[in-house]
């Protein structure tokens, strides 16, 4: 069975820069990847960046950066120009489409002890969505 | 149109460092990693590592740790990957290649000729 | 690191002909594999993604497939301009590493 996982981390130099890495783990072809903050994509959650394999990649604030980082996980920066933070609270969420498989996402956030630099283990987390 | 440009051939002593340049033209090293990659005569691919030109950030082949050293100046557009401690094992075509608006090397450099010998 | 084991070394065949390639990796990639092509004298090209995507403006003569550690790479029907050594990489997890390489040459 196909599986996402997500792993957010707060850059240890800069305080109020973030980083969400997702990956998927199965046999398809990755056709798109969606992140959104503040629940699922099309369930409440807002989009912060698409990339698509072939047309490349798109992001919007406060995404700064969304890049592949192999074919199978991807990683998004993330700056926060307000004084307080609010990602530290955010639910980050990850969906693949995947051909044959279909789509899968997972969501993670910030762990609450995280120390700048650290990073939630990169294990699979449950998959809540798979269309 | 994309392109990678290369700094051209090295001749240099055993011991010595070299930097090599890659200097990125149609699209914005900080949109990418770019990474490095090594090849000797009749001999496969071997990768170097790669740096996030964004904040400097470097990964390396375990093999290639303290041998190499990559860095990026995004007001240029430029990567760099500085050898040191040249041995004539050093000697072989090394090419930059981006990686990260698609999940593949989609543009190489032409490659740099590094020759080490007394 | 994955090792990545590419067989055969040489190829020599005649225009027309099939030729297969494959790459064994040491362990599981799932499809995290890509061919390349390269031509004496110039930087490698890619051929195929995922294992089986075929890139923009590449022949159909060039096909891969494969998942888990066993993929293979075939040229349906061998071209005069074919002639260059192909590689297979994966970049599943890091460091990126490539088979050794097949050099084909034409009869």
């Known amino acids: 069975t196909p599986e996402v996982w997500v792993q957010v981390q707060m850059e240890a130099t800069e305080l109020s820069s973030f980083t969400v890495h997702c990956g998927f783990l199965g046999p398809g072809s990755i056709s798109l990847v969606t992140v959104s903050w503040g629940g699922p994509d099309g369930a409440g959650g807002t989009k912060l960046a698409v990339l698509h394999p072939e047309l490349g990649t798109r992001q919007w604030a406060p995404a700064r950066q969304a890049r592949w980082e192999t074919q199978s996980s991807i990683s998004l920066a993330l700056e926060d120009s307000g004084a307080s933070s609010p990602f530290a609270n955010t639910t980050f969420c990850c969906k693949f489409a995947s051909f044959p498989e279909g789509s899968w996402e997972s969501c993670g956030s910030l762990p609450p002890s995280s120390d700048p630099g650290l990073s939630a283990p990169p294990t699979p987390v449950p998959i809540l969505r798979a269309d | 149109e994309v392109q990678l440009q290369q700094s051209g051939a090295e001749l240099v002593k055993p011991g010595a460092s070299v930097k090599l340049s890659c200097t990125a033209s149609?699209?914005?090293?900080?949109?990418?990693?770019m990474h490095w990659l090594k090849q000797r005569p009749e001999q496969g691919l071997e990768w170097i590592g790669r740096v996030d030109p964004t904040n400097g950030n470097s990964e390396y082949d375990p093999r290639f740790q303290g041998k190499a050293t990559l860095t990026a100046d995004t007001s240029s557009n430029i990567a760099y990957l500085q050898l040191s401690s040249l041995t004539s094992e050093d000697t072989a075509v090394y090419y930059c290649a981006r990686f990260g608006i698609y999940p593949y090397f989609d543009y190489w450099g032409q490659g740099t000729t590094l020759t080490v010998s007394s | 690191s994955i090792v990545m084991t590419q067989t055969p070394k040489f190829l020599l065949v005649s225009a027309g002909d099939r030729v297969t390639i494959t790459c064994k990796a040491s362990?599981?990639?799932?499809?995290?594999v890509v061919w390349y092509q390269q031509k004496p004298g110039q930087s490698p090209k890619l051929l195929i993604n995922y294992a089986s995507n075929r890139y923009t403006g590449v022949p159909d003569r060039f096909t891969g497939s494969g998942y888990g550690t066993d993929f293979t790479f075939s040229i349906s029907t061998v071209q005069a301009e074919d002639l260059a050594v192909y590689f297979c990489q994966q970049d599943y997890s890091s460091p990126w590493t490539f088979g050794g390489g097949t050099k084909l040459e034409i009869k």
């Open positions: 149609g699209f914005n090293i900080k949109d990418i990693y």
């Open positions: 362990q599981s990639v799932n499809k995290a």
